[in-house]
């Protein structure tokens, strides 16, 4: 007979998996918060800045109680992919003014990428249906001016901060229900 079968593959504790995802999200939230503050110090924002290509915030009211894990993870992954694309674009096309935010923008991009991989892993570990591959997004037009790049940076970092704050809330609550 062949070698004895190995021990059965133990499915990781979903609470522990979710916990490490929450901590990674909080860590990215801290980075985003710090970078947004740095941007405000260097280039004070006059009012709110928006960018049409950014995802709309996943939730605007106190409907956290109705959240389900598959929906939160799928939506969070989609939104963070969009933000990753926007951060990459900002680093490439944002202009010389935003070079002062390096290497922090690069670090943010790497950590965003790490969180996305963690979400992908969590979804497969929890046997959640994998979303279909994203259709190629239309390229983002370069900012019309240096100030346009700065306004875009305010919008991207502000939106990412709110998305991550919302994600932490949702994930923390879902963890208590597991």
């Amino acid at each position: 007979p062949g070698p004895p079968p190995g021990p059965p593959r133990v499915s990781p504790d979903p609470r522990a998996e979710l916990d490490s995802t929450v901590l990674l999200t909080r860590s990215l939230l801290a980075d985003t918060r710090q970078l947004a503050a740095q941007l405000r110090d260097k280039f004070p924002a006059d009012g709110d800045h928006n960018l049409d290509s950014l995802p709309t915030l996943a939730m605007s009211a106190g409907a956290l109680g109705a959240l389900q894990l598959p929906g939160v993870l799928t939506r969070l992954r989609a939104d963070l992919l969009s933000y990753l694309r926007h951060v990459q674009w900002l680093r490439r096309a944002g202009g010389s003014s935003l070079k002062t935010l390096e290497p922090e923008l690069g670090t943010l991009q790497a950590r965003l990428d790490r969180l996305l991989r963690r979400l992908q892993l969590l979804m497969s570990r929890l046997a959640l249906p994998q979303p279909p591959p994203d259709p190629p997004a239309p390229p983002l037009a370069p900012p019309s001016s240096a100030w346009g790049g700065i306004r875009a940076a305010h919008a991207i970092l502000g939106g990412l901060h709110l998305t991550l704050d919302w994600a932490v809330r949702g994930l923390l609550l879902l963890k208590t229900r597991l």
């Epitope: 860590s27 009211a61 919302w166 609550l173 208590t176």
Partner: antibody, heavy 119, light 111 residues
Framework: EVQLVQSGAEVKKPGASVKISCKAS????????MDWVKQAPGQRLEWIGD????????IYNQKFTGRATLTVDKSASTAYMELSSLRSEDTAVYYC????????????WGQGTTVTVSS | DIVLTQSPASLALSPGERATLSCRAS??????????IHWYQQKPGQAPRLLIY???NLESGVPARFSGSGSGTDFTLTISSLEEEDFATYYC?????????FGQGTKLEIK
């Protein structure tokens, strides 16, 4: 100067509700979350919940879920905490405190609002 | 919920002496490069005041005689040389998980 100013002391009957306000000044209200903390006589501090001024979406300590309601009025830079179905154990000082979910410590506190529940 | 236990419950020292306050968590509160423990000072009739955040970072405006250390489950607040205004109650708080909780406090009294 960064400040959180809370509404005055309240005396309530058991079963009633109380709504406490917390007016923020000296910083951009939407840049931080608002948390609420209870301090009953002789008890440790107890976190009630947290709200993001931009998106709402409060989260609560399970112990207070269903009885505490956190809201904000962005235009007035004011946060509110309502506590319903009051009982004698709710007699305490309630604080609002500025926080954020990344590290979740409280760097600015209101002066506290004393709520007395007595028949 | 994570339970924080502070010791001693009270401590009587003289101005100029060194104070060492302990906070023990029922499970590790350190992860992802952070130790999620914070320290506050509270005087009678006043709101708590943040002293130390993330175990060892001194809050702006807090005197350098205050310092924090520790990781995992054991944390310490040290006051290197006590001043009259340091006699108060000190609380630790964790923010590792929902809900954040506080220790029961250590009352620092003048000997």
């Amino acid at each position: 100067e960064v400040q959180l100013v809370q509404s005055g002391a309240e005396v309530k009957k058991p079963g009633a509700s109380v709504k406490i306000s917390c007016k923020a000044s000296g910083y951009t209200f939407r840049d931080y979350n608002m948390d609420w903390v209870k301090q009953a006589p002789g008890q440790r501090l107890e976190w009630i919940g947290d709200i993001n001024p931009t998106i709402g979406a409060p989260i609560y300590n399970q112990k207070f879920t269903g009885r505490a309601t956190l809201t904000v009025d962005k235009s007035a830079s004011t946060a509110y905490m309502e506590l319903s179905s009051l009982r004698s154990e709710d007699t305490a000082v309630y604080y609002c405190a500025r926080g954020e979910l990344a590290h979740w410590y409280f760097d600015v506190w209101g002066q506290g609002t004393t709520v007395t529940v007595s028949s | 919920d994570i339970v924080l236990t502070q010791s001693p419950a009270s401590l009587a020292l003289s101005p100029g002496e060194r104070a060492t306050l302990s906070c023990r968590a029922s499970k590790s509160v350190s992860t992802e490069g952070y130790s999620y423990i914070h320290w506050y000072q509270q005087k009678p009739g006043q709101a708590p005041r943040l002293l130390i955040y993330l175990a060892s970072n001194l809050e702006s405006g807090v005197p350098a005689r205050f310092s924090g250390s520790g990781s995992g489950t054991d944390f310490t607040l040290t006051i290197s040389s006590l001043e009259e205004e340091d006699f108060a109650t000190y609380y630790c708080q964790h923010s590792r998980d929902l809900p954040p909780t506080f220790g029961q406090g250590t009352k620092l009294e003048i000997k």
